[in-house]
């Protein structure tokens, strides 16, 4: 598999990390998060060329199927492979809590 | 999040599990694979409109966040939840060896 | 850049209360929550508690509930802590600390030393 | 509430040495860790979150590691300037709690 930062469409153009600056209201969280009022929220986007960061046996057959049956068969999918936790501050019947979601941001990013 | 048949786009249209049959030629493996002669490929297919089988909360904001900035943000992509093993019959220097591959077909498909 | 200032020291008699104020600066006041921790002379630290400052909504440890008052003046940009019916064992500094995430503190004010002393 | 336990109490390094600060939750916190450095006469600084997150400005010569109840914070070559004492945080469940620090002194 290609090197992560090797992107044969150009760089910065592959599946990578970007950062989206979102708010509660953006989020449709507005009405039950306190904290924090904005959140970075880090996904993955970009395109999965041939093998580029190519997760497991099935993003490589996908690839191969895809380059074979391109109506049929998507290219791969930029995911994350990982996440990174995040506390959010949230409205409560008595008050508010704390609670960590441990599935809300992309730590790093895979083709699937 | 919409039940996992409930397509909102019209049966079938929705991310779900397709089965492609794929030879070793198709894969490019037939110089290191010698069984099975063809294999069928289950993969995840479909598109994944708001809330669908969405994986986890990273998949809610990428649909609140892709409503808002289409351009930036890609819609949640339909991949692999879990993946059922296979074993393959493969050519080594001294003969053949039987590999199981824990990666290679999806079992079920979730939006992310 | 983000900062926080806090006022200055405070010398008390057992009973009384104290007010210690936090001014921010360098981003959006309401888009950080601010939390309240001490440090005893000699030990460690001790988180009091939290405030929201877009609408005041705070959580206390419950240790100082009842004693301890979280509020913000939003238009001042300045969030403060008042502690009653002082004891000698609340001299400490209080430090205002500003967070991003709720879960850890990323920036903190100065130090306010309270002394409680008859 | 969660106590957090930190050791040693004191530790005394030679600067290039490595340096391992542990601290022990009372039940699991997952990862919800946090590791501050805090000089005399200063406010603390926040050094690694989430038990083995990097933050901007930090040396790369601190480190954080662990989960659930033991957890790790490692100076692989200590320098004059981190001498100070070290304080575990977690954020697993209000109230916060801190640990009674570790003190790192330069030989």
């Known amino acids: 598999a290609r090197n992560g930062d090797d992107c044969p469409l150009g760089p910065g153009r592959c599946c990578r990390l970007h950062t989206v600056r979102a708010s509660l209201e953006d989020l449709g969280w507005a009405d039950w998060v306190l904290s924090p009022r904005e959140v970075q929220v880090t996904m993955c986007i970009g395109a999965c060329p041939s093998q580029f960061r190519a997760a497991n046996m099935h993003a490589q057959i996908k690839t191969s199927l895809h380059r074979l049956k391109p109506d049929t068969v998507p290219a791969p999918c930029c995911v994350p492979a990982s996440y990174n936790p995040m506390v959010l501050i949230q409205k409560t019947d008595t008050g508010v809590s704390l609670q960590t979601y441990d599935d809300l941001l992309a730590k790093d990013c895979h083709c699937i | 999040a919409r039940n996992g048949d409930d397509c909102p786009l019209g049966p079938g249209r929705c991310c779900r599990l397709h089965t492609v049959r794929a030879s070793l030629e198709d894969l490019g493996w037939a110089d290191w694979v010698l069984s099975p002669r063809e294999v069928q490929v289950t993969m995840c297919i479909g598109a994944c409109p708001s809330q669908f089988r969405a994986a986890n909360m990273h998949a809610q904001i990428k649909t609140s966040l892709h409503r808002l900035k289409p351009d930036t943000v890609p819609a949640p992509c339909c991949v692999p939840a879990s993946y059922n093993p296979m074993v393959l019959i493969q050519k080594t220097d001294t003969g053949v060896s039987l590999q199981t591959y824990d990666d290679l077909l999806a079992k079920d498909c979730h939006c992310i | 850049q983000v900062q926080l200032v806090q006022s200055g020291s405070e010398l008390k008699k057992p009973g009384a209360s104290v007010k210690v104020s936090c001014k921010a600066s360098?981003?959006?006041?309401?888009?950080?929550?601010i939390n309240w921790v001490r440090q005893a002379p000699g030990q460690g630290l001790e988180w009091i508690g939290w405030?929201?400052?877009?609408?005041?909504?705070?959580k206390y440890n419950e240790k100082f509930k009842g004693r301890a008052t979280l509020t913000v003046d939003t238009s001042a940009s300045t969030a403060y802590m008042e502690l009653s019916s002082l004891r000698s064992e609340d001299t400490a500094v209080y430090y205002c600390?500003?967070?991003?995430?709720?879960?850890?503190?990323?920036?903190w004010g100065q130090g306010t030393t309270v002394t409680v002393s008859s | 509430e969660i106590v957090l336990t930190q050791s040693p109490a004191t530790l005394s390094v030679s600067p290039g040495e490595r340096a391992t600060l542990s601290c022990r939750a009372s039940?699991?916190?997952?990862?919800?860790l946090h590791w501050y450095q805090q000089k005399p006469g200063q406010a603390p600084r926040l050094l690694i979150k989430?038990?083995?997150q990097s933050i901007s400005g930090v040396p790369d010569r601190f480190s954080g590691s662990g989960s659930g109840t033991d957890f790790t914070l490692k100076i692989s070559r200590v320098e004059a300037e981190d001498f100070g004492v070290y304080y575990c945080?977690?954020?697993?469940?209000?109230?916060?709690?801190f640990g009674g620090g570790t003190k790192v002194e330069i030989k």
């Open positions: 989430y038990a083995s």
């Open positions: 039940q699991s916190i997952s990862y919800y």
């Open positions: 405030i929201y400052p877009r609408d005041g909504i705070s």
């Open positions: 945080q977690q954020s697993n469940s209000w109230p916060y709690t």
């Open positions: 600390a500003g967070t991003y995430d709720p879960a850890y503190f990323d920036y």
């Open positions: 360098g981003y959006t006041f309401t888009s950080y929550d």
